[in-house]
Interface confidence: low
């Protein structure tokens, strides 16, 4: 079934930017669909993006449009989280999903931390 | 391989009638993960290349006229032509994307009833 | 606008080789799996080869009835998809078509044909 | 946006008791006959993990004490009987359209 691995994430000023990676140790990455999903402190879980097969599909939740960018290597098995214009409530767990339809594969999330 | 088996090879119907295209794979291309049948159909005119009418088994490509439409799961599908026009003469073909060694049906050719 | 434009199609004698082009425009061509599908005269359409995008390393799929004689590339520089047919047969004559491959695997853009006539 | 309303947003049910989330969404997830519904658990400290797709369908490694229910719009996870191990927060999730979105949680504790 294969494991996600998210990393990138740390403590980063308001306004900066942090690049968050997802290494899939699965033998299917490039067959499926891949999502971030992000829990802020105490919350519920928001869907942020995801990515096709292929990488020439992509969908973003209004709220990060313009300022979160989703890419993929199928050659690495790897998915990328690129977050610009941090803002304070971008603070949460940033969780790497495999996504069928259903999230099926999560990864163990990755702690993005936006404060002065 | 997955086999596409069209029928009827040929069928005649006439104008304003409705014209139904079946088409039958060797396995399901119903994907359990998302519920999805990954089957197209193609119409193809004289001398030009198949053009795209209906994929996911039923959802119609844009600009397609309303009267095509798909239905179908798992292993039996269907392309119905609700009220057939002169210009929907044609040969139509079913595929299956169920897997990257994609495979067509054999093709049935529509003629009008005179 | 997606275009797809194939050539080097013609009369070729039995045994003989030819390479099938395919100029692409219209889109990011490195985004897209390309295919190549073909027609013999009156006959149903049969998918031959496929290759894949640049997210997935340019990867080939072959339909097993070709037996190794058919080669498809890609030129990224100039978006050209090749079509290498070696050991040509008299069956192997038919419409060759250029297919553009869509993100949910159907084929979305088709070329209008190249013809092959394969003769003594 | 297809918003899903979770009810109630927290439970406390007595060991051996059987427990009933719900989530009702905006509109209709239904497609090519299929619920595009699904259920998570989420323990203190660790990623949601898949209970239920496709509205009815247990993921393989759920208890047995695990079901799903319902279509359309209104759609319910049992637990059934409660057991001490199901402590956590539970999430239905819609992928019938784009933006994906979740209900707000429910919290499950033993009374």
């Known amino acids: 079934e294969g494991q996600l691995v998210e990393s990138g994430g740390g403590l980063v000023q308001p306004g900066r930017s942090l690049r968050l990676s997802c290494v899939d140790s699965g033998f299917s990455f490039s067959n499926n669909w891949m999502s971030w999903v992000r829990q802020s402190p105490g919350k519920g879980l928001e869907w942020v993006a995801n990515i096709n097969e292929d990488g020439s599909e992509k969908h973003f939740v209004d709220s990060v449009k313009g300022r979160f960018t989703i890419s993929r290597d199928n050659v690495k098995n790897s998915l990328y989280l690129e977050i610009n214009s941090l803002r304070v409530e971008d603070t949460a767990v940033y969780y790497c999903v495999r996504n069928n339809s259903y999230f099926n594969v999560w990864g163990q999330g990755t702690t993005v931390t936006v404060s002065l | 391989d997955i086999v596409m088996t069209q029928s009827p090879d040929s069928l005649a119907v006439s104008l304003g009638e409705r014209a139904t295209i079946n088409c039958k794979s060797s396995q399901t291309i119903l994907h359990r993960r998302n519920n999805k049948n990954y089957l197209a159909w193609y119409q193809q005119k004289p001398g030009q290349p198949p053009k795209l009418l209906i994929y996911w088994a039923s959802i119609r490509e844009s600009g397609v006229p309303d009267r095509f439409s798909g239905s179908g799961s798992g292993t039996d599908f269907s392309l119905i032509i609700s009220s057939l026009q002169p210009e929907d003469v044609a040969v139509y073909y079913c595929q299956q994307y169920n897997n990257s060694l994609c495979s067509f049906g054999q093709g049935t050719k529509l003629e009008i009833k005179r | 606008e997606v275009k797809l434009v194939e050539s080097g199609g013609g009369l070729v004698q039995p045994g003989g080789s030819l390479s099938l082009s395919c100029a692409a425009s219209?889109?990011?061509?490195?985004?897209?799996?390309m295919n190549w599908v073909r027609q013999p005269p009156g006959k149903a359409l049969e998918w031959l080869a496929l290759?894949?995008?640049?997210?997935?390393?340019?990867?080939?799929e072959y339909s097993a009835s070709l037996k190794g004689r058919f080669t498809i590339s890609r030129d990224n520089s100039q978006s050209i998809l090749y079509l290498q047919m070696n050991a040509l047969r008299a069956e192997d004559s038919a419409t060759y078509y250029c297919?553009?491959?869509?993100?949910?695997?159907?084929?979305?853009?088709w070329g209008q044909g190249t013809t092959l006539t394969v003769s003594s | 946006d297809i918003v899903l309303t979770q009810s109630p947003a927290s439970l406390a049910v007595s060991l051996g008791q059987r427990a009933t989330i719900s989530c009702r969404a905006s509109?209709?997830?239904?497609?090519?006959?299929?619920?595009?519904m699904q259920w998570y658990q989420q323990k203190s400290g660790q990623p949601p993990k898949l209970l239920i797709r496709?509205?009815?369908n247990v993921e393989s490694g759920v208890p047995a004490r695990f079901s799903g229910s319902g279509s359309g719009t209104d759609f319910s996870l049992n637990i059934h009987p409660v057991e001490e191990d199901d402590i956590a927060m539970y999430f239905c999730?819609?992928?019938?359209?784009?933006?994906?979105?979740f209900g707000g949680g429910t919290k499950l504790e033993i009374k």
């Open positions: 297919v553009r491959e869509n993100i949910n695997y159907y084929f979305d853009y």
């Open positions: 219209g889109f990011t061509y490195t985004d897209y799996y």
């Open positions: 290759i894949r995008n640049k997210a997935n390393g340019y990867t080939t």
């Open positions: 509109e209709s997830v239904e497609y090519f006959g299929a619920s595009l």
């Open positions: 496709a509205a009815t």
């Open positions: 999730q819609q992928s019938r359209k784009v933006p994906w979105t």
